[in-house]
Amino acid sequence: TRDIREPPALKYGIVLDAGSSHTSMFIYKWPADKENDTGIVGQHSSCDVPGGGISSYADNPSGAGQSLVGCLEQALRDVPKERHAGTPLYLGATAGMRLLNLTNPEASTSVLTAVTHTLTQYPFDFRGARILSGQEEGVFGWVTANYLLENFIKYGWVGRWFRPRKGTLGAMDLGGASTQITFETTSPAEDRASEVQLRLYGQHYRVYTHSFLCYGRDQVLQRLLASALQTHSFHPCWPRGFSTHVLLGDVYQSPCTVAQRPQTFNSSARVSLSGSSDPHLCRDLVSGLFSFSSCPFSRCSFNGVFQPPVAGNFIAFSAFFYTVNFLRTSMGLPVATLQQLEAAAVNVCNQTWAQLQARVPGQQAHLADYCAGAMFVQQLLSRGYGFDERAFGGVIFQKKAADTAVGWALGYMLNLTNLIPADPPGLRKGTDFS
């Protein structure tokens, strides 16, 4: 007889990413005997919660919990039954809930209480539902990307762990309500709030991170709409031939549009707004989102926020990817350089409503916003973060790495389950022939 080697036992972890516009559930798995290896944790499955983000349940907190049931039931089937009790379950909420917590902390607490109530009904090892800080969101996204791309440590053929020479990748995340930039830097931080010191696998990393609340795609679109109402009788970023009715109360209810809010306005007033396909005026409107007038540090990105010069290669994911992918795929435009990205944005902004619909059939509801989205991404990267052509050449737009979605969720779980040790593994893996 010969021994049959059983496959190594798998462990699982679940993270609910409660974003501003929707919630996604990610189930991760890894071999139990290789917990400390890098790149060993991967995505097992995922599930999109139907409907809006949990912050949209401010008036109906119990609905926030109930909305998660379908995905949690899927988790019961995706994770083997004997592993349920040992599977950590986390919910992390991001900028949508940060905004709700600013405007209505009681509602924010009620929503988190309601989702906690639902999550505790399941047989997993529930470890809490909380709102992540912008800094955490940025850093965990950076950890995810570099973990998946195996930039922290590598396992050599002689069985020793070693750190690869390739350095780490910066991470840029564009969500619905905020955007994050995170990268390793040698410059000391002039603003302590933007520096994070990490020790991973025995290596020390000095990381710059900043999260800009209200600079997520959905909130940017709201702010541009508010600006268009304030300064024009039309929307320069919308295509000519497109018009819609806008309720003033909807535009000004977000804390992100407070700067454009008139002192007195009728919240139930309806305004008809039409597009004008004007790339130059649209660029001006988008430029108004960024302030460069004052900087209390030696250098800033925008709005007086300290940022060292961007260094190294970057991965740009979430809405960065979707925006650029639309330009590349749906519009067939080159976006390999900053100049091309700007030209692509201008191209989209020049299109009339009829031209856009003919180019991309079946997506009318969203097409009107691609001009503003593209213009914002181009301005944020070039003027906001200071990418020049050379630096932009090192940016890859990608939503997945190693078949796993890039975002803060994996990094968050790796951190909370101690799957990335601070020190390198003590035992050698394999045989040392030296």
């Epitope: 516009s21 809006g52 926030a64």
Partner: antibody, heavy 125, light 106 residues
Amino acid sequence: EVQLVQSGAEVKKPGESLKISCKASGYTFTDYNMDWVRQMPGKGLEWMGDINPKYDISTYNQQFKGQVTISADKSIRTAYLQWSSLKASDTAMYYCARRGFFLYYGINYYYFDVWGQGTLVTVSS
Amino acid sequence: DIQLTQSPSSLSASVGDRVTITCSASSSVSYIHWFQQKPGKAPKLLIYSTSNLASGVPSRFSGSGSGTFFTLTISSLQPEDFATYFCHQWSSYPWTFGQGTKVEIK
């Protein structure tokens, strides 16, 4: 052609049980959730719940939880709505509806794209 | 739950008229879908995601709006358009419908 064909009208007495069906054709049954919608006589539409045939997962509107059971049989591409004990207030037209979706910015957005012809359930003593 | 209130509840119009139906949500929603229902028939999808025309729906139907205020417009009413119209939201659980707007012949 995508079609949903529902079982015929039913006349029942209070306290009786009932199971109505919705047979799908023209698409991959397990790729879409199936929802059930109630329309009481002369009234609007109410979402009752749904079934994910791939995972055999049902979710319910709290208003209907415990009152009905939603299930599916993948092998015959059919979804079901059942009652263990009918009440007069269950008298209504019941529709199955396929949950269509499209992807935008990485998120699935849903809508009822195809409906069954409806099953009229009358509960009367 | 999010309440959807349609206005008007009913209206009388003539062939060729421009008709606008509004749908007001009790809380902000991402999108609204519109259905048409004729007596004794199942609802039929007209517009999904606020302004996307469903397959086979004539271009005289259009939708717009955002947040809590949405509209369905029929640019030139045709005889086959006399029916009841429902709005529907899929932003917040449980998914809800408006009470309906009946479009009758004047």
